[in-house]
C-alpha cells in the first residue's frame, strides 16, 4: 500500500479511509503543486488510470464517485497534468479499505487440556470483515469480581497462574473494528469443569489364533482423572459407517478392548474421551489401523450377533462419514446397535 | 484504592514526538489490560488505544502506525509514544483500566498541545 508519500496536495475519502462494503464513495483530491496550473487531475486505483465519474471541481480540485465500492483494499493514487512536463505529477495516495462490522461472536467455549497449564476459549467469528477485527476476551471472576481481558484475534490462551484467585468466572467476547462493536454470549465456567484429559493414544493391536478370532486393541493415556468414559469408533478402511463403542476408563493401567471382526480385512480405530459426566471431549485420536488376520476355517460371519466387547459397553452406535475426504466429520445414523439388534435412538455427535 | 498519574504531555510542533506515561498502584498491574482515551476540545471522549497483561495491543484509524502503547510491569507504569503528531492530535489524555472503551475514571490527565 501507500504507506508513506511525500503529498504535493491532499486526497481524502468520504465516507472515510474505511467503510462498510457496497457503500457509495467519492475520493477527493486537490493539488498544491508549484508552477502548475493543471490540465487535468486524473485517478488512479491499484496503478490502473480511471476513466469514468470524475468530476472537475474547481481548478485545484476533483473528484471521483463509485457506485456501490465492494472491494476489500484499493490503493489509491492522483496526478496532475502540468503544461510543459512529460510526465504526470504526483499530488497525493491513500488505501482504503471496505468492509463489515464484525458479528457477534457465538458458540463461545473455553476448555483447559489437562497439564496445559492454559484455559483455552475459541468462538465463531461469523462472516468474514475483510478489515483488521480484534476480540477483546472478558474473564470476570464471580467469586471476586476483577475483570481480567486479553486481546486475540481467533482464539486465547490463558495461563491457569492468572486464574488463581477463583474457581468460577464469566466470559465473553467482544468483537470491535472500524465499523463496529458486537458481544458474545456470556458462558458461565467452572474451571473444575472444563479439563479434558490427556490425549488418550492407540498403541497397538492384535488378532488372536482361536476359533473365533478376537482382535485386542491396547490403548492409554496418561490422564490423572480418575473418572473416564470413553468411545471408540473403528470401521473397515472400505467403509463409511464407523461402530462407535463406550467405556468407562481407569487409565490406570493399559485399557484393553477386545473386538470381534472381519476377518483378512483392514481397520480402523480412534479413541476419544471425556471427565465423566462432564461436557468436553478430546479430539479423536490419531487413526490406528489394524489388519485382522485370514479367516482358519469356514465361518458365516454376523456383525448383529457377535459378541462385541469383553469390557463394559454401554452402547455400540454406527456413523456414517460424509466425505471420505473429511474422517472426522461424522453423521449419525438414526439406527443404534445395542444388544446385538438394531434400535432407534439418539446418540451425541461425533466428529 | 485504584489510582492512575498520567504525565508527559507538552507543546510540540506538528510532526514533533511525546511520551506519556501513567504510573498505576492499588491493583495488580500486571494482570490488567490499560488503555488511553483522549478528548479534544469541545469534544467528547475518544478511545485511543489498548493493551492487555500479554502486551498485545489494539489502536483507533486515527493514530494507527504513529502511537504506540507499552506497559512496563516492574514500575507499574502505562506508557504512549506519540509520533508524528497532527494538530488533530491536541487533546487531554487520560488512562484508564480495561483495553476498550471511550471512559476514565476520573484521573487528571495530561494535555497535549500540538501546533505551530
Known amino acids: 500500500g501507500i504507506t508513506s508519500i511525500n503529498c504535493s496536495g491532499d486526497m481524502w475519502v468520504e465516507p472515510g479511509e474505511i467503510f462498510q462494503m457496497g457503500m457509495n464513495v467519492s475520493i477527493y483530491c486537490q493539488e498544491a503543486l508549484k508552477h502548475c496550473r493543471p490540465r487535468n487531475l486524473y485517478f488512479y486505483k491499484n496503478g490502473f488510470k480511471e476513466e469514468f465519474d470524475i468530476t472537475r471541481i474547481n481548478r485545484t480540485t476533483a473528484r471521483i464517485w463509485y457506485k456501490g465500492f465492494s472491494e476489500p483494499h484499493a490503493y489509491m493514487h492522483c496526478t496532475a497534468e502540468c503544461p510543459g512536463h512529460f510526465q504526470e505529477t504526483l499530488i497525493c495516495g491513500k488505501d482504503i479499505s471496505s468492509g463489515h462490522p464484525p458479528d457477534a461472536p457465538s458458540n463461545l467455549t473455553c476448555v483447559i487440556y489437562e497439564y496445559s497449564g492454559n484455559m483455552t476459549c475459541t468462538w465463531n467469528t461469523g462472516k468474514p470483515t475483510y478489515i483488521d477485527t480484534k476480540y477483546i476476551v472478558h474473564v470476570k471472576s464471580l467469586e471476586t469480581e476483577e475483570e481480567q481481558q486479553y486481546l486475540a484475534s481467533s482464539y486465547v490462551k490463558i495461563s491457569t497462574d492468572s486464574l488463581q484467585g477463583s474457581r468460577k468466572y464469566l466470559v465473553w467476547v467482544q468483537a470491535v473494528n472500524s465499523l463496529g462493536m458486537e458481544n458474545s454470549q456470556q458462558l458461565h465456567v467452572h474451571l473444575d469443569d472444563i479439563v479434558i484429559p490427556s490425549a488418550s493414544i492407540i498403541s497397538r493391536a492384535e488378532t488372536t489364533n482361536d476359533t473365533v478370532p478376537k482382535t485386542i486393541v491396547y490403548w492409554k493415556s496418561k490422564t490423572m482423572i480418575e473418572k473416564v468414559f470413553c468411545e471408540m469408533r473403528y470401521k473397515t478402511t472400505t467403509n463409511q459407517t464407523w461402530s462407535v463403542k463406550e467405556f468407562d476408563a481407569n487409565f490406570t493401567y493399559v485399557q484393553q478392548s477386545e473386538f470381534y471382526l472381519e476377518p483378512d480385512s483392514k481397520y480402523v480405530f480412534q479413541v476419544r474421551c471425556q471427565e465423566t459426566g462432564k461436557r468436553n471431549w478430546q479430539p479423536w485420536s490419531s487413526p490406528f489401523v489394524h489388519q485382522t488376520s485370514q479367516e482358519t476355517g469356514k465361518r458365516n460371519w454376523q456383525p448383529w450377533s457377535s459378541p462385541f466387547v469383553h469390557q463394559t459397553s454401554q452402547t455400540v452406535s454406527q456413523v456414517t462419514a460424509k466425505s471420505s475426504h473429511e474422517p472426522q466429520k461424522m453423521e449419525m445414523l438414526s439406527a443404534t446397535i445395542f444388544r446385538g439388534h438394531p434400535a432407534s435412538g439418539n446418540h451425541q455427535d461425533i466428529g | 484504592q485504584v489510582q492512575l498519574q498520567e504525565s508527559g504531555g507538552g507543546l510540540v510542533q506538528p510532526g514533533g514526538s511525546l511520551r506519556l506515561s501513567c504510573a498505576a498502584s492499588?491493583?495488580?498491574?500486571?494482570?490488567?489490560?490499560m488503555r488511553w482515551v483522549r478528548q479534544a476540545p469541545g469534544k467528547g471522549l475518544e478511545w485511543v488505544s489498548g493493551i492487555d497483561s500479554r502486551g498485545s495491543t489494539i489502536y483507533a484509524d486515527s493514530v494507527k502506525g504513529r502511537f504506540t502503547i507499552s506497559k512496563d510491569n516492574a514500575k507499574n507504569t502505562l506508557y504512549l509514544q506519540l509520533n508524528s503528531l497532527k494538530t488533530e492530535d491536541t487533546a487531554m489524555y487520560y488512562c484508564?483500566?480495561?483495553?476498550?472503551?471511550?471512559?476514565?475514571?476520573g484521573s487528571q490527565g495530561t494535555q497535549v498541545t500540538v501546533s505551530s
Open positions: 484508564a483500566q480495561g483495553v476498550y472503551g471511550d471512559t476514565y475514571s
Open positions: 492499588g491493583f495488580t498491574f500486571r494482570l490488567t489490560a
